[in-house]
């Protein structure tokens, strides 16, 4: 049996407010910032997590600036607009009426414009490459052990179906994890690769989104896997539309 009802907390999202006001007095949790009900048996969408993060008091935030290595998501944090399912709206605007189009992981994929900018559809990010460098160890990790442990991590901690972990590459000290998920492959109830990658990124940075205060404990054959830098590359089903001016800058 589970003691979760006694505590009424959300194991998969610490940025929630929970109370036993659901049907039959069941624990119900709502995301900070949006107030949207979340399913605590799975990951919360990145859009709702970003919204919750931006709504948190400034003194409660830790390490909110994006890493200097975040070469792709270089706009960093913003307060996003989410649709009723918690996904990013295709068009995002700030308070000064500057607008841009984003992909399904909330990363800008066009030049910035004004309120007349149109974003016809939310373009799916179907391929995510997570590039890690681990801290020095006594020797290299065994590739097959590393591969198996990372696949198990994504399956058990992030609840991502194994078929979406396309590959794990390793050339000491660089580890690359490839996540692939086309629109046609994603069934109802499947965790989105963008959400899994975001939870993993926050775990690696020591900013776990899970309720427990311990944080990620990842080992390969008992040897801790400690990451010293992370790069995440996003590939969309439709290529992004940036002007040549940006590309040559």
């Amino acid at each position: 049996h589970t003691a979760a009802q006694d505590n009424c907390t959300c194991p998969t999202n610490k940025m929630t407010v929970c109370s036993p006001d659901g049907p039959g007095g069941r624990c119900q949790c709502r995301a900070l910032g949006s107030g949207m009900a979340v399913d605590c048996s799975t990951l919360t969408s990145k859009c709702l997590l970003l919204k919750a993060r931006m709504s948190a008091p400034k003194n409660a935030r830790t390490l909110v600036r994006p890493s200097e290595h975040a070469l792709v998501d270089n706009d960093g944090l913003y307060d996003p607009d989410c649709d009723p399912e918690g996904r990013f709206k295709a068009r995002q605007c700030n308070q000064t009426s500057v607008c841009w189009c984003v992909n399904s992981v909330g990363v800008r994929r066009t030049d910035k414009g004004d309120l007349s900018l149109r974003c016809d559809e939310l373009v799916r990010t179907h391929h995510i490459l997570i590039d890690l460098r681990h801290r020095p160890t006594a020797g290299a990790f065994n590739h097959s052990d590393l591969d198996a442990e990372l696949r198990r991590l994504f399956r058990e901690r992030y609840r991502l179906h194994p078929k979406f972990v396309a590959a794990v590459h390793y050339e000491q000290p660089t580890i690359q994890i490839e996540l692939r998920q086309n629109t046609s492959q994603k069934a109802a109830g499947d965790v989105d690769i963008g959400d899994a990658a975001y939870y993993f990124e926050r775990d690696i940075k020591g900013e776990s989104l899970f309720q427990g205060r311990g944080g990620l404990d990842l080992r390969v054959r008992g040897e801790p896997l400690q990451v010293e830098r992370t790069l995440i590359y996003y590939l969309d089903e439709i290529p992004p539309k940036f002007s040549m001016k940006r590309l040559t800058a």
Epitope: N7, G212, G214
Partner: nanobody
């Protein structure tokens, strides 16, 4: 859903030993921090011992240090508690518990919020220490 089933409790004389076992239904418990708790009439619920998923780090309540040993066999999805030099004050219902999230670092055994980390519980096994 994680399901846990304790066994091995019973009546034992002071100074005696018992070994409790906890069988887990779910393969994913192999990557979860696990713990033993006990409930007594006098003291309420108390954390007894915690073990990380790799089985390399263990944590004990001061009242059982040097007498109890927590261990696990992930190939059998089983948690153990070896109880030696038992005392009458060890009489309690013993529960095994599993952490909410796999690959999560174990909480401190003295953390007042420890129960939040362990939502999955067995039904318990009764240990009675009496002459």
């Amino acid at each position: 859903q994680v399901q846990l089933q304790e066994s091995g409790g019973g009546l034992v004389q002071p100074g005696g030993s018992l070994r409790l076992s906890c069988a887990a239904s779910d393969y994913s418990t192999g990557r979860r921090c696990m713990a033993w708790f006990r409930q007594t009439l006098g003291k309420g619920l108390e954390g007894v011992a915690i073990i990380d998923y790799a089985g390399t780090s263990t944590y004990y309540a001061d009242s059982v240090k040097g007498r109890f040993i927590i261990s696990r066999d992930n190939s059998k999805n089983t948690l153990y508690l070896q109880m030696n030099s038992l005392r009458p004050e060890d009489t309690a219902m013993y529960y095994c518990a599993a952490a909410a999230i796999p690959y999560e670092r174990c909480p401190d055994i003295s953390d007042p919020q420890i129960l939040v980390s362990f939502p999955y519980w067995g039904q318990g096994t009764l240990v009675t220490v009496s002459s």
